[in-house]
């Protein structure tokens, strides 16, 4: 088999979500995602990112906030907030572009 291309250096991150296989994970960067689904309290998930770095640049909305960082366990003590609820005419979308 050909040698698999390197994805570059990996960083160790805190992993706290229902899908974590352990207390840490390794990825290209660390993430914190704060999500509020309709009628539920916001949930904060910590983990690793490898794809779609563009989501890190998305501005917070009243439903979601993405945070990314690039150093060892840098997502461990980060707390995010959502945008304050806005009137229907000024609600932002969740599109990251």
């Amino acid at each position: 088999d050909p040698v698999k291309p390197s994805r570059g250096p990996l960083v160790t991150c805190t992993c706290e979500s229902p899908h974590c296989r352990g207390p840490t994970c390794q990825g290209a960067w660390c993430t914190v995602v704060l999500v509020r689904e309709e009628g539920r309290h916001p949930q904060e998930h910590r983990g690793c990112g490898n794809l779609h770095r563009e989501l890190c640049r998305g501005r917070p909305t009243e439903f979601v906030n993405h945070y990314c960082c690039d150093s060892h366990l840098c997502n461990r003590n980060v707390s995010l907030v959502l945008e304050a609820t806005q009137t229907p005419s000024e609600q932002p979308g969740t599109d990251s572009q």
Partner: antibody, heavy 118, light 108 residues
């Protein structure tokens, strides 16, 4: 194993909105490891990426379709959906949903044909 | 926007022959995010190769991928009857997600 299944009307009237749903079975749409994509293929043509959604609800769209596309997710139903507004004959295509992870688009739905009914 | 150009558009070969398909990117892309798919009429695409050179689960070893930067290649070492299909390359994992136009491998 994880499977994807597209559903929705096969005929859409001109200027109306195309609505399709992709149901994920055998795995959770809320896994942070995956992104959930829509792709289409015009008859006899190549593949055109439409956009993706993450479990958080964050989206990214093909710039050429962005003004008409909305992708949404319902984690409680393990589904994500596509809406394409102001359809014309140029939107007649097979529409696929697909899961994207580190191993690329590793799982696809079987596709659903959508025709402009003009 | 990254444009992926595949060549040739059509490749006419006989079973047992070697097929070499090219995918050229308009700008350098990470080989970690270059994939190849096979599509047969009436079917969804099937993942063959990811990371430019890693075979997907269940893919026979006659399929191999190589390349970096702007030039990538899919090689089928000995064509089997079931390999005659359309092949697409794809850049994934970023906002610049795009497919090549495809190469049709047909029976000569």
């Amino acid at each position: 194993q994880v499977q994807l299944q597209e559903s929705g009307p096969g005929l859409v009237k001109p200027s109306q909105t195309l609505s399709l749903t992709c149901t994920v079975s055998g795995g959770s749409i809320s896994s942070g490891d995956y992104y959930w994509n829509w792709i289409r293929q015009h008859p006899g043509k190549g593949l055109e990426w439409i956009g993706y959604i993450y479990y958080s609800g964050s989206t990214y769209y093909n710039p050429s379709l962005k003004s008409r596309v909305t992708i949404s997710v319902d984690t409680s139903k393990n589904q994500f959906s596509l809406k394409l507004s102001s359809v014309t004959a140029a939107d007649t295509a097979v529409y696929y949903c697909a899961r994207e992870g580190l191993e690329a688009f590793d799982i696809w739905g079987q596709g659903t044909m959508v025709t402009d009914s003009s | 926007e990254i444009v992926l150009t595949q060549s040739p558009g059509t490749l006419s070969l006989s079973p047992g022959e070697r097929a070499t398909l090219s995918c050229r990117a308009s700008q350098s892309v990470s080989s970690s995010y270059l994939a190849w798919y096979q599509q047969k009429p009436g079917q969804a695409p099937r993942l063959l190769i990811y990371d430019a050179s890693s075979r997907a689960t269940g893919i026979p070893d006659r399929f191999s991928g190589s390349g970096s930067g702007t030039d990538f290649t899919l090689t089928i070492s000995r064509l089997e009857p079931e390999d005659f299909a359309v092949y697409y390359c794809q850049h994934y994992g970023s906002s610049l997600l795009t497919f090549g136009g495809g190469t049709k491998v047909e029976i000569k």
